[in-house]
């Protein structure tokens, strides 16, 4: 495989709504127009994919409906949002990069993004 | 159904342009690559290039570059690939087809051809 | 530029009998990530080309499962079990591993 650099944050926290964002960028070796970005979460040596999308450049990144990860895409750099996280979901959020068109395909997968998680604590009952 | 529908056939003098146009429809233009081949008579298949209808991207194959500009209206979903300083060896039928991620980039759909004669 | 080469260059055939048609690449089309970039295309008489296969061996819909594409990184085949009158026309391999995209030179399949 054409190995390419895809870079991404060392650690992010989630907000207290469950959700993480972050960057991943790609040194493009080449003129690439449709990118496959896929979102890998490693955890307790298992990886499990989390979401992916395929776009073309110019055009909207679109996850599946019922996807957990939305995001934007400008250049060759890719806004990435993760809802719905719990503090049981804390790991490590791999960015993997495929340049799917024009040939050749290259392949970058990121060192990972450590997302940490904290449930919020349930709100004490109030007297009023 | 998807449909290309290509420009008319067109005659040109030696030097001359031509401007051969591919309008799609059936599906949504800007999700596809719009591939551009060509087929000289009595002979095999000739990439020329293709072009991103998002942002007008294209990549084109060295032997036409400087003579071909490919270009889109997404208005009305139509592709155009424009060859400048014709030759006689430019005589061909040319092709516009569209490209399809799930069968990895092969062209699934193409317009019928225009019949390009450069002769003086 | 990768050059394929296709043989033979004419097919006379008996329909209800196999053909079989080769193709050559000058690279292998086999990438690491597990794809054989390999595509076959048919030209019926004064028609556009159509697609066949992709992926060296996968049907495009609504190719009829007598065509089959088989092949290495380098050598490939395109079979038909048992040949129609409707599969006359010029079958071409082609390539997209690298750009620029290239095409065999087409072998014509001709009834006897």
């Known amino acids: 495989c054409k190995a390419m650099h895809v870079a991404q944050p060392a650690v992010v926290l989630a907000s207290s709504r469950g959700i993480a964002s972050f960057v991943c960028e790609y040194a493009s070796p080449g003129k690439a127009t449709e990118v496959r970005v896929t979102v890998l979460r490693q955890a307790d040596s298992q990886v499990t994919e989390v979401c992916a999308a395929t776009y073309m450049m110019g055009n909207e990144l679109t996850f599946l409906d019922d996807s957990i990860c939305t995001g934007t895409s400008s250049g060759n750099q890719v806004n990435l949002t993760i809802q719905g996280l719990r503090a049981m979901d804390t790991g490590l959020y791999i960015c993997k990069v495929e340049l799917m068109y024009p040939p050749p395909y290259y392949l970058g997968i990121g060192n990972g993004t450590q997302i940490y998680v904290i449930d919020p604590e349930p709100c004490p009952d109030s007297d009023f | 159904q998807v449909q290309l529908v290509q420009s008319g056939a067109e005659v040109k003098k030696p030097g001359a342009s031509v401007k051969v146009s591919c309008k799609a429809s059936?599906?949504?233009?800007?999700?596809?690559?719009i591939n551009w081949v060509r087929q000289a008579p009595g002979q095999g298949l000739e990439w020329i290039g293709d072009?991103?209808?998002?942002?007008?991207?294209?990549n084109s194959n060295q032997k036409f570059e400087g003579r071909v500009t490919m270009t889109v209206d997404t208005s009305i979903s139509t592709a155009y690939m424009e060859l400048s300083r014709l030759r006689s060896d430019d005589t061909a039928v040319y092709y516009c087809?569209?490209?399809?991620?799930?069968?990895?980039?092969?062209?699934?759909?193409w317009g019928q051809g225009t019949l390009v004669t450069v002769s003086s | 530029d990768i050059v394929m080469t296709q043989s033979p260059l004419s097919l006379p055939v008996t329909p209800g009998e196999p053909a079989s048609i080769s193709c050559r690449s000058s690279?292998?089309?086999?990438?690491?990530?597990?794809?054989?970039?390999l595509y076959w295309y048919l030209q019926k008489p004064g028609q556009s080309p159509q697609l066949l296969i992709y992926?060296?061996?996968n049907l495009a819909s609504g190719v009829p499962d007598r065509f089959s594409g088989s092949g290495s990184g380098t050598d490939f085949t395109l079979k038909i079990s048992r040949v129609e009158a409707e599969d006359v026309g010029v079958y071409y391999c082609?390539?997209?591993?690298?750009?620029?995209?290239?095409f065999g030179g087409g072998t014509k399949v001709e009834i006897k």
């Open positions: 087809a569209r490209l399809r991620r799930e069968y990895f980039y092969a062209m699934d759909y």
């Open positions: 059936g599906y949504k233009f800007t999700d596809h690559f």
């Open positions: 072009i991103n209808p998002n942002n007008g991207g294209t």
């Open positions: 690279k292998s089309l086999l990438h690491s990530n597990g794809i054989t970039y």
């Open positions: 992926q060296m061996s």
């Open positions: 082609a390539q997209n591993l690298e750009l620029p995209l290239t």
